[in-house]
Each structure stands twice: as structure tokens, then as C-alpha cells.
């Protein structure tokens, strides 16, 4: 027989198949020119000394081969003795050490076989109804097409699936998608209408992350407030490895996840940007307000579900450095001034309300005054801070009000509202003797004593009725009690309390009379 | 010793909130996370959140979310965990548990928490 | 959430045979953030194993964990008397979800 003829004799091999594992597969033939065809075909095991022959058998029953040796393609023309105008099953015999292995047959008229491409360049991927939709233009002159897709995860084996006819210069294919496991999709094509052509090769590996993205474990914490009025915000993370199929290994488009770092400062809400999102590697400075944190997790198909994070504000208190002055038109606060061209936030809420919304005011840009200090004003007819009781304020600052991780605290402190002097008057003051020249004066705490820090001091003041002469006792914000000595006995006394504040002088109680009795020895 | 010490069992009706806490020793308090787990009558283990003792900062799981508020108080080494809006489902032993290197490797002795009307 | 199922429910053994406890995930358990506790009744979890497969301080030598990705074992290679109690396996990979509980009882 002549090599690029088909011969039709016994082959010079023994007919048996022996069943194994190895062996031809994944036979294909088609059409390559107007008067030339191909078959290929793949060859699983060792290929030492192995011998492949293309087997035919025409619709009369007549067969042939082709004798390829070790290669497993083969070329020849519409002369080589193969029907090509008519049904033809073609299958491989490879011989090897004495055994002949057969591929499974295909069954097809070689001139309507067409060598169809894969879906070639750019597959789309998105997700639609809970499924994944794949998209691809349709290779050129190939309209009208049976496409087939197999898919693995990690720990499964392919999976075949079936895309339907495509009829288009587009081609689509609705695919399963797995909730938390990445896969592996390749595409397949073949002439539609001619069952028992060729498919073509699988495409290139299309690989699709999970719907959800892994949510990474993550530590947050926070450095102290620093000078500055910022804080670092650092981060400790568990590393997180998404599982790949084989074919996604290595730098595969597609099943990446990025995290971000949702940032959203819950202090100062009337601010112009409550939220920002950054790039987890940046880790930012916060002001001292309270945030809540998140990170979020996202891949092609969006944000997985996030875990957020709540970072309470910094409730360190400076000494004073607020200036607070009540006049006739209203009322000013005063505080040492940052930079030029700096927006001020000044939050205040009523202690012991802290679940509630703060009252919050944003200054245009200012500049320091001539002294230094920033300044914030407002009528009394805005009732701001009126009631008589304590208030706890946060000033912030920021020169970029716009961008969150630019704000910074100036100042968070305390402070009475309303009539401090006449609300901070105690009561209930008693004088009780505590020996033959002194006595012991208690009073109910000062409401003032309620608001961390300002309470400066209690005065206790103490007025001889007779010769009219007046003794004042400075005592610590925190007793509420004091003994006064050398007394005389039989003499009237008036005793009057007040609290201060470090701006304020307090207004005295109500004068309480006592005297001590004169001991009258026997 | 290294310990977590829980307060003692609470009895509350429908509705109402409970605080529970627990004492740490025998370690640097804010070095460590912790935890609150519980554990309903005869069933298994819940994470409820955490809290980072040295900024106050917290996460909870979803399903406690806006009820649940984890504090902590450093003068004392204390760490508290409010549950409010109590259900009787809510009826569990409540767990404080230190974090190690993300897994829990030192557990109080639990909060016996009644709800019932 | 990932969840956890733990196999069997119940496991009657006698002192000096072998206990092996399953730990099934619903999805792959990454770099294998999984610890085992064992609980006495009345009494708070004790941490026997952390990362699949190290024992934590004090935990003897009979006690310990494998496995990878969804699959993990605990194998107890003696029972003494003290280790009859309820074994749960927990990941710490993606928040924190335990087992239902493997209870070892005596038989």
C-alpha cells in the first residue's frame, strides 16, 4: 500500500483490544482545504516503541488504514481511497509490547466537517439569576455552533455541561456558581446540525471565583491619641488562601479578591463625607471620634459579606484648654487655634446620653486670631447648650474638611450649661459641732460635680456675726466636707458654700446660722 | 495565675438587659483579645464578638448585632458583655474566652443567664 | 458561614481503645485555622488542638489532630477515664463556627 493512500488490507497487528486505561483518545477529524483533510488525535502513556494506525470503514462495510508510526496526526486528500462525501467511522489502533489499544470511534462525512475553533480572546464573565453567564464572540465564519463546557473545583474532577446551540455572532453559555469555591470553566465547539463532527480543543481555562468572597479574619486596634490628635489604626491579619482548581494556578485572571478598608467616622455628623474606602495596605490616622470599621471583600461579582468593626472615640480629656465666656448677645468658646484656613467640627451631647445623636456645628474656614484662638459663637436664642446640666464636647479639626483621614481632635472636654453659677449652688448644707471650737459642715455634691473636671473647687465661707469678719476655706472638688476650728463659743456664726469653676465663681447657698453653746462647769 | 473570673448566674425576665463580666489576671490585660461564646441548655457553642481591651474595639456576630454591646474597664481588667432586649432563647451559659493566636486558649467558667417570665 | 459537622454524634468506647472524632467543613478551612476542644459537663471547653494539628500546652501525647482543606480528625490513641466528654471542632479561618459536638461516651 502507498503511505498516502488508505490500505485496505489486514493491518500487520493482532485485532484485540486490551482494555486499558491507557491509550488513543479524543479523536477528531475535518476538513482543511477544499481537497484536504486531518485527523488528530491524543495519546495517553508511555509512547516509547508505540505504533499508530488510523482505522475507516466505509458505509459498505469495506475498511482501511492509514499507518502513522509514532505520530499521532495525519493529513491526505479526498484521493487517498476515504469516501469523503459520505458517512465514515474512523477510530486509532495503537500498538504496543504485543497489545493494541483502540480509541472510541467517531462516525462523520469528512467534507461537511469543519475544524471548529474553541471561543477564542476575551470570555465574559458576570452573573445572572444566581448563575454564571459566559460570553464570547463567535470565531470568524463559524455561525451556528453545539458548545459543551466542563468545570472542576479544587477537590472535584470535570464536569460536563451543556451550553445548547448558538446561532449568532455572539455565543453564551449559562453555567453553575458556586457559592464558596472557586472553578475552572473551559468551553468547547463544534458544528451545529452534524452530530458526530469534531469538537474543537477546550479553550484556554476560564477561571471564576466563589460568589462569595473569602472574608479574611482580621484584628483591629489603636494606637494612642497622640499630640497631633490622631491615631494609627493598625491592622493584624490572618493570611486567607483561596483554594484554586489545577488550571488556575499560577497568576489566573479572574479569581482575584481585593479588600478594602470602609472607613465611616460616626462623630461629627454634620460634616461634608462620613464614609471613605481605602486600599487595605494604607492604613490610616483617625481623629479621636468614634468610627466603625470595616473590610470588604470583593471579586468580579461585587463586595462579599463584611464584618464591621466599632472603634469608640478616645474619651481622654484635656485639663481645660477650652475657654468658654457667657456674655449678654451669647455665648463663645475659645481654643488654641491650629493651622491657617482650618475647619472646625464642634460636637456636643448631654452626659449620660450617649446612644442619643450629638449636637454637631461646622465653622467656615478660619484663621487664628490675634491671639491664637479659634472661636465659635452663638445666640442664646439657639438654646445651643442652655439647658442646666452637663455636656461633653469634641472639638475637630481638619484643613481638607472633604477627606475623612484628615480630621484630627483639638480638644474634648466637659462643661456645665445654663446658669452654671446659680445650678452649681449645693445644698443641703448642715453644720454639726465636732468639738468646743470647731465644727464640721457637709453639703449635698454640686451639680457641677457630675461633669468631669469642672468642678474646680468648693469655698466654704464662714462670717463672725459680731465682729463681722469672714474666713474663706478652699476645699477639693471631690470631698464635701470641711472642719472649721478656733471658734468661740456663744458667739453667732453664718456659714455659706459655693462651687467654682475655672472660669466661673460660683453663687453662695443659703447662710446657715450656728453658734456653740457656752459650757457652763458645774 | 492566669485567669478569666465570670459574675454569677442572673435570673431576668423577658424584655430586660443583663451585664456580665469578666475579671482577668495573671496576664497583661490589653494584650490579649476576648471573646463571648455561649451555650444554650444541652446545645452547642455561638460566638457572640469581640473586643480588643486596649482601644475598646469591637466586632459582633450578625445575628447579636444592635443588641449585644462588649466594653471593657482597664483600671480593673475587666471585660463586660450587655445583652439586652432578653428572649427566653437567650437562656445559656455565657463564656468569656482569651484569644491566642486566633483560637480560644483560656475559657472562664460561664454565666448561667436565666430568662423566664 | 462555614459550617461544621461533626461525626459520629455518639461514640461508646472503652478505656484503652482508640477514639477517632470527624470534622467535616462546608467549605475548604483555610490554612487550616481549626482547633478541637473537649468539654466536661458543668464545665467550661478546654483547647486540645489549634492550626488541625498541634496540641496545646499541657495536652498529652495521646491526644492528637490532622487533616486539611474540609476533612479533619481527632484521634485519641488510649482513652483514659478522664477523656470521656463532648469534643467540638472549631474554624477560626472566617469568623468563628463550631461543630454540634462529638459526645465520647464509656461503654
Known amino acids: 500500500c502507498r503511505t498516502s493512500e488508505c490500505c485496505f488490507q489486514d493491518p500487520p497487528y493482532s485485532d484485540a483490544d486490551s482494555g486499558s486505561a491507557s491509550g488513543p483518545r479524543d479523536l477528531s477529524c475535518y476538513r482543511i482545504s477544499s481537497a484536504g483533510y486531518e485527523c488528530s488525535w491524543q495519546y495517553e502513556g508511555p509512547t516509547a516503541g508505540v505504533s499508530h494506525f488510523l482505522r475507516c470503514c466505509l458505509s459498505s462495510g469495506r475498511c482501511c488504514y492509514f499507518a502513522t508510526g509514532s505520530a499521532t496526526r495525519l493529513q491526505f486528500s479526498d484521493q487517498a481511497g476515504v469516501s469523503v462525501l459520505h458517512t465514515v467511522t474512523l477510530w486509532v489502533e495503537s500498538w504496543a509490547r504485543n497489545r493494541t489499544e483502540k480509541s472510541p470511534e467517531v462516525t462523520l462525512q469528512l467534507y461537511k466537517s469543519v475544524k471548529y475553533k474553541p471561543p477564542l480572546g476575551d470570555i465574559k464573565v458576570s452573573k445572572l439569576a444566581g448563575q454564571l453567564r459566559m460570553e464570547w464572540e463567535t470565531p470568524d465564519n463559524q455561525v451556528g455552533a453545539e458548545v459543551q463546557f466542563r468545570h472542576r473545583t479544587p477537590s472535584s474532577s470535570w464536569k460536563l455541561g451543556d451550553c445548547g446551540p448558538q446561532d449568532d455572532d455572539t455565543e453564551s453559555c449559562l453555567c453553575p456558581l458556586e457559592m464558596n469555591v472557586a472553578q475552572e470553566f473551559q468551553l468547547r465547539r463544534r458544528r451545529l446540525g452534524s452530530q458526530g463532527s469534531s469538537w474543537s480543543k477546550w479553550s484556554s481555562p476560564v477561571c471564576v471565583p466563589p460568589e462569595n468572597p473569602p472574608q479574611p479574619q482580621v484584628r483591629f486596634s489603636v494606637e494612642q491619641l497622640g499630640r497631633d490628635g490622631r491615631r494609627r489604626l493598625t491592622l493584624k491579619e490572618q493570611p486567607t488562601q483561596l483554594e484554586l482548581p489545577e488550571g488556575c494556578q499560577g497568576p489566573a485572571p479572574g479569581v482575584e479578591v481585593t479588600y478594602q478598608l470602609q472607613l465611616h467616622m460616626l462623630s461629627c455628623p454634620c460634616k461634608a463625607k462620613a464614609t471613605r474606602t481605602l486600599p487595605l495596605e494604607k492604613m490610616p490616622y483617625l481623629s479621636g471620634a468614634a468610627y466603625n470599621v470595616a473590610v470588604i471583600s470583593s471579586n468580579r461579582f461585587g463586595p462579599g459579606p463584611n464584618q464591621t468593626w466599632h472603634i469608640p472615640a478616645d474619651t481622654h480629656t484635656e485639663p481645660v484648654a477650652l475657654n468658654i465666656s457667657v456674655g449678654t448677645n451669647g455665648t463663645t468658646m475659645y481654643w488654641p487655634a491650629r493651622a491657617q484656613s482650618t475647619t472646625y467640627c464642634i460636637e456636643w451631647q448631654p452626659v449620660g446620653q450617649e446612644g442619643s445623636l450629638a449636637t454637631c456645628n461646622l465653622t467656615a474656614p478660619q484663621d487664628p486670631d490675634p491671639a491664637g484662638m479659634a472661636t465659635y459663637s452663638w445666640s442664646r436664642e439657639s438654646g445651643a447648650m442652655g439647658q442646666e446640666k452637663c455636656y461633653h464636647i469634641t472639638i475637630f479639626a481638619s484643613a481638607h474638611p472633604k477627606k475623612l483621614t484628615l480630621w484630627s481632635t483639638v480638644l474634648s472636654t466637659y462643661h456645665f450649661g445654663g446658669n452654671a453659677s446659680a445650678a452649681g449652688t449645693p445644698h443641703h448644707v448642715s453644720v454639726k459641732n465636732h468639738s468646743l471650737d470647731s465644727v464640721s459642715v457637709d453639703w449635698a455634691p454640686s451639680l457641677l460635680s457630675t461633669c468631669p473636671g469642672v468642678l474646680k473647687e468648693y469655698v466654704v465661707r464662714c462670717r463672725d456675726e459680731d465682729s463681722n469678719q469672714v474666713s474663706e476655706h478652699p476645699v477639693q472638688p471631690t470631698e464635701t466636707q470641711v472642719t472649721l476650728s478656733d471658734l468661740r463659743a456663744g458667739v453667732a456664726y453664718t456659714v455659706q458654700v459655693r462651687a467654682d469653676t475655672a472660669w466661673l465663681r460660683g453663687a453662695w447657698s443659703q447662710p446657715q446660722r450656728f453658734s456653740i453653746k457656752v459650757q457652763v462647769s458645774d | 495565675q492566669v485567669q478569666l473570673v465570670q459574675s454569677g448566674a442572673e435570673v431576668k425576665k423577658p424584655g430586660a438587659s443583663v451585664k456580665v463580666s469578666c475579671k482577668t489576671s495573671?496576664?497583661?490585660?490589653?494584650?490579649?483579645?476576648i471573646h463571648w461564646v455561649r451555650q444554650a441548655p444541652g446545645q452547642g457553642l455561638e460566638w457572640m464578638g469581640i473586643?480588643?481591651?486596649?482601644?475598646?474595639?469591637?466586632s459582633y456576630a450578625q445575628q447579636f448585632q444592635g443588641r449585644v454591646t462588649m466594653t471593657r474597664d482597664t483600671s480593673t481588667s475587666t471585660v463586660y458583655m450587655e445583652l439586652s432586649s432578653l428572649r427566653s432563647e437567650d437562656t445559656a451559659v455565657y463564656y468569656c474566652a482569651r484569644e491566642g493566636d486566633w483560637y480560644f486558649d483560656l475559657w472562664g467558667r460561664g454565666t448561667l443567664v436565666t430568662v423566664s417570665s | 458561614e462555614i459550617v461544621l459537622t461533626q461525626s459520629p454524634g455518639t461514640l461508646s468506647l472503652s478505656p484503652g481503645e482508640r477514639a477517632t472524632l470527624s470534622c467535616r467543613a462546608s467549605?475548604?478551612?483555610?490554612?487550616?485555622?481549626l482547633a478541637w476542644y473537649q468539654q466536661k459537663p458543668g464545665q467550661a471547653p478546654r483547647l486540645l488542638i489549634y492550626g488541625a494539628s498541634s496540641r496545646a500546652t499541657g495536652i498529652p501525647d495521646r491526644f492528637s489532630g490532622s487533616g486539611s482543606g474540609t476533612d479533619f480528625t481527632l484521634t485519641i490513641s488510649r482513652l483514659e477515664p478522664e477523656d470521656f466528654a463532648v469534643y467540638y471542632c472549631q474554624q477560626y479561618g472566617s469568623s468563628y463556627t463550631f461543630g454540634q459536638g462529638t459526645k465520647l461516651e464509656i461503654k
Open positions: 467549605q475548604s478551612v483555610s490554612s487550616s485555622y
Open positions: 495573671g496576664y497583661t490585660f490589653t494584650s490579649y483579645y
Open positions: 473586643i480588643n481591651p486596649s482601644g475598646g474595639i469591637t
